[in-house]
C-alpha cells in the first residue's frame, strides 16, 4: 500500500500528552526506531512518569483515508468484555505548512491525533519545494513551534553589514518569491531557502535537510545545506551552509531582526531573537487571556465579548464579515455554525461562511504582537478551513467605550485578516521569566 | 502583483506640511510591506519610512525621524506619508511601493512601484 501523505514521510515526528506526561514518535510511512517498541511500531508511546515504552500503533496494520490514517496493534485493551484492539488514529486537515502533529486524547483502547498539513489539502497551493518539521520538544516536553515564522511568500532580510551582498532566508521552507515578480528576490533559485544576492546575481547557499533542533532551552537551531554538487566560485572550495540559531530572549521585548554573526567560506551563521523560540504555553492561550507567572504579561481581552446577540461588523467591500470574539454567543447569520467569525456576501445574504469558529481559538502575544486567531472554519476549493487572524494594536482613546471596532485589511488563501485598535490591547508586562 | 498609486504631492514653503497617499489596488496580500521612498534629481533613490501591514510596526530613514509619519488605513488599503517641518532638501519625487520581504530598507528589495508624486519645497 503506498504512503498516504509523502511529504511527512521523511522524518520521525513527536507528539505530547502534556498532562499525563507521555511522548509520542510518529512515523507515519514505516517505523519509529525504537527498540522498546519493537521493530515495526509506526507510533510508539513513551510514558516518562513509568519510564515504559509502548507500541500504540503497527505499520503493518496501517488502513488510510484522504483524511484519517489509523494505525491498529495486537493488543487488547483493559476494557472488559470487549475485543477491542489498541489503535492510533490520525485526523488530517488542511494547513499551510507541513504543521504538527496534535494530541487529542486518549481512551483506553484510542490514542487520538489532529494533523493540519499542507499533505492533507486537496490543491498544491500550500506545498513548498522542500520543507522540514519546524517544532521541537525540550527536555520538559515543552513544544517549541517556528511554524509561524514561515513564509508563504517572500522571505526575512539578515542584517548584514556587507552592502554589497543581501541574505535572505526563510524558515523551514524554501522561499517563494512568484507573488513578487519585480523584485531582486525574483532571482533566487528555486528550492533555495538561503539565497545570497550579489548584484543582479543570486546563488543558493541553503536548503532545508533536517528539521528544527534544540541545542538548549531556549536556543534552537536549523541547518541549511546546498543540494547540489557543484561548488560556487566565490567559496573557496566549499560548500555552502547555514545555521541559524532562534534564540529566546531572557524577557519580553518586541521582534528583532536575524542578524549574521559569522561568515567564511560561505558558511553563515545567523542568529535571531525571537520569542517564537521560546516554549508555546508562554506566547499563546486557548482562553481570550494570557497572565500569570509564566507569561511575564497582563493580557485580558474579554471585555470585547459581545452580548445579546449583537456582533461586530466590518466591512470587506464584497463581504461583510460579523465578528463575535472571546464568547460563545451565536452569530444571527452564522446560526448553528459555532463562528466566531462569519462571512456573509452582499449581493446573496444567503452565502454565509464561518471563518473561524469560536472553540478553535489561539490568544499569541510573541515579538510585541498580539494576536486572536480563530480557525476551523467551512472549508474552501483547498480543502483549507477558512480562518481569521485578528491584529490587535494598544489605543487608549478607542472609541465604543475603549472597546474600538474590528477593520478588515485582506484575504490571503482563505485567511481573513482584521487589525482593532482597542484599549484592551494594552499590554501590562512583569518582569520574571 | 499590487498595483499603487500615489498622490499629495506639490509646492511648500520650508517648514510647512504635507500629506501623501498611497492606494494599493489588486490583491493587497498581508505578507507585503509598504515603504516610501524617494529620489531627488542626480540622486540614487533612498529610503524613507516603512510600515507592515499587519501591524503598524514602522521604521524611519534618520533624516526624516520625527518629522515625518507613515501610517495606513486598512480599509481603503492606503499607506499615507505626513512629512511635517519640510525643508529644501526634501524635494524628490516620493514613491510608494511594496515588498514580500520582512525588515528591508533597500529599494531593490521590493516589488511592486507606484509613479511617484513630485514635492518641491522652498526656501
Known amino acids: 500500500q503506498a504512503a498516504p501523505f509523502p511529504e511527512l514521510c521523511s522524518y520521525t515526528w513527536e507528539a505530547v500528552d502534556t498532562k499525563n506526561n507521555v511522548l509520542y514518535k510518529i512515523n507515519i510511512c514505516g517505523s519509529v526506531d525504537i527498540v522498546q517498541c519493537g521493530p515495526s511500531s509506526a507510533v510508539c508511546m513513551h510514558d516518562l512518569k513509568t519510564r515504559t515504552y509502548h507500541s500504540v500503533g503497527d505499520s503493518v496494520l496501517r488502513s488510510a483515508t484522504r483524511s484519517l490514517l489509523e494505525f491498529n496493534t495486537t493488543v487488547s485493551c483493559d476494557q472488559q468484555g470487549t475485543n477491542h484492539r489498541v489503535q492510533s488514529s490520525i485526523a488530517f486537515l488542511c494547513g499551510k505548512t507541513l504543521g504538527t502533529p496534535e494530541f487529542v486524547t486518549a481512551t483506553f483502547c484510542v490514542h487520538y491525533f489532529e494533523w493540519r498539513t499542507t499533505a492533507a489539502c486537496k490543491k498544491d497551493i500550500f506545498k513548498a519545494n522542500k520543507e522540514v518539521p519546524c517544532y521541537v520538544f525540550d527536555e520538559e516536553l515543552r513544544k517549541h513551534d517556528l511554524n509561524p515564522l514561515i513564509k508563504l511568500s517572500g522571505a526575512y532580510l539578515v542584517d548584514d553589514s556587507d552592502p554589497d551582498t543581501s541574505l535572505f532566508i526563510n524558515v523551514c521552507r524554501d522561499i517563494d518569491t512568484l507573488r513578487d515578480p519585480g523584485s531582486q528576490l525574483r532571482a533566487c533559485p528555486p528550492g533555495t531557502a538561503a539565497c545570497l544576492v550579489r548584484g543582479h546575481q543570486a546563488f543558493d547557499v541553503g536548503q532545508p535537510r533536517d528539521g528544527l533542533k534544540v541545542v538548549r532551552k531556549d536556543r534552537l537551531v536549523l541547518s541549511y545545506v546546498r543540494e547540489e554538487a557543484g561548488k560556487l566560485d566565490f567559496c573557496d572550495g566549499h560548500s555552502p551552509a547555514v545555521t541559524i540559531t532562534f534564540v529566546c530572549p531572557s524577557e519580553r521585548r518586541e521582534g528583532t531582526i536575524p542578524k549574521l554573526t559569522a561568515k567564511s567560506n560561505c558558511r553563515y551563521e545567523i542568529e535571531w531573537i525571537t520569542e517564537y523560540a521560546c516554549h508555546r504555553d508562554y506566547l499563546e492561550s486557548k482562553t481570550c487571556s494570557l497572565s500569570g507567572e509564566q507569561q511575564d504579561v497582563s493580557i485580558d481581552l474579554t471585555p470585547l465579548a459581545q452580548s445579546g446577540g449583537s456582533s461586530y461588523i466590518s466591512d470587506g467591500k464584497e463581504y461583510l464579515f460579523y465578528l463575535n470574539v472571546c464568547g460563545e454567543t451565536e452569530i444571527q447569520f452564522c446560526n448553528k455554525k459555532q463562528a466566531a467569525v462569519c462571512q456573509v456576501k452582499k449581493s446573496d445574504t444567503s452565502q454565509v461562511k464561518a471563518a473561524g469558529r469560536y472553540h478553535n481559538q489561539t490568544l499569541r502575544y510573541s515579538d510585541g504582537d498580539l494576536t486572536l486567531i480563530y480557525f476551523g472554519g467551512d472549508e474552501c476549493s483547498s480543502g483549507f478551513q477558512r480562518m481569521s487572524v485578528i491584529n490587535f494594536e494598544c489605543n487608549k482613546t478607542a472609541g465604543n467605550d475603549g472597546k474600538g471596532t474590528p477593520v478588515f485589511t485582506g484575504e490571503v488563501d482563505c485567511t481573513y485578516f482584521f487589525t482593532w485598535d482597542t484599549e484592551y490591547a494594552c499590554v501590562h508586562h512583569h518582569h520574571h521569566h | 502583483q499590487v498595483q499603487l498609486q500615489e498622490s499629495g504631492g506639490g509646492l511648500v514653503q520650508a517648514g510647512g506640511s504635507l500629506r501623501l497617499s498611497c492606494e494599493a489596488s489588486?490583491?493587497?496580500?498581508?505578507?507585503?510591506?509598504w515603504g516610501w521612498f524617494r529620489q531627488a534629481p542626480g540622486k540614487e533613490r533612498e529610503f524613507v519610512a516603512a510600515?507592515?501591514?499587519?501591524?503598524?510596526?514602522?521604521s524611519y530613514a534618520d533624516s526624516v525621524k520625527g518629522r515625518f509619519t507613515i501610517s495606513r488605513d486598512n480599509a481603503k488599503n492606503t499607506i499615507y506619508l505626513q512629512m511635517n517641518s519640510l525643508k529644501p532638501e526634501d524635494t524628490a519625487v516620493y514613491y510608494c511601493?511594496?515588498?514580500?520581504?520582512?525588515?528591508?530598507?533597500?529599494?531593490?528589495?521590493?516589488?511592486?512601484w507606484g509613479q511617484g508624486t513630485q514635492v518641491t519645497v522652498s526656501s
Open positions: 511601493a511594496a515588498s514580500i520581504v520582512d525588515f528591508t530598507t533597500n529599494p531593490s528589495h521590493f516589488g511592486s
Open positions: 489588486g490583491r493587497t496580500f498581508n505578507t507585503y510591506n
Open positions: 510600515i507592515r501591514w499587519s501591524s503598524s510596526k514602522t
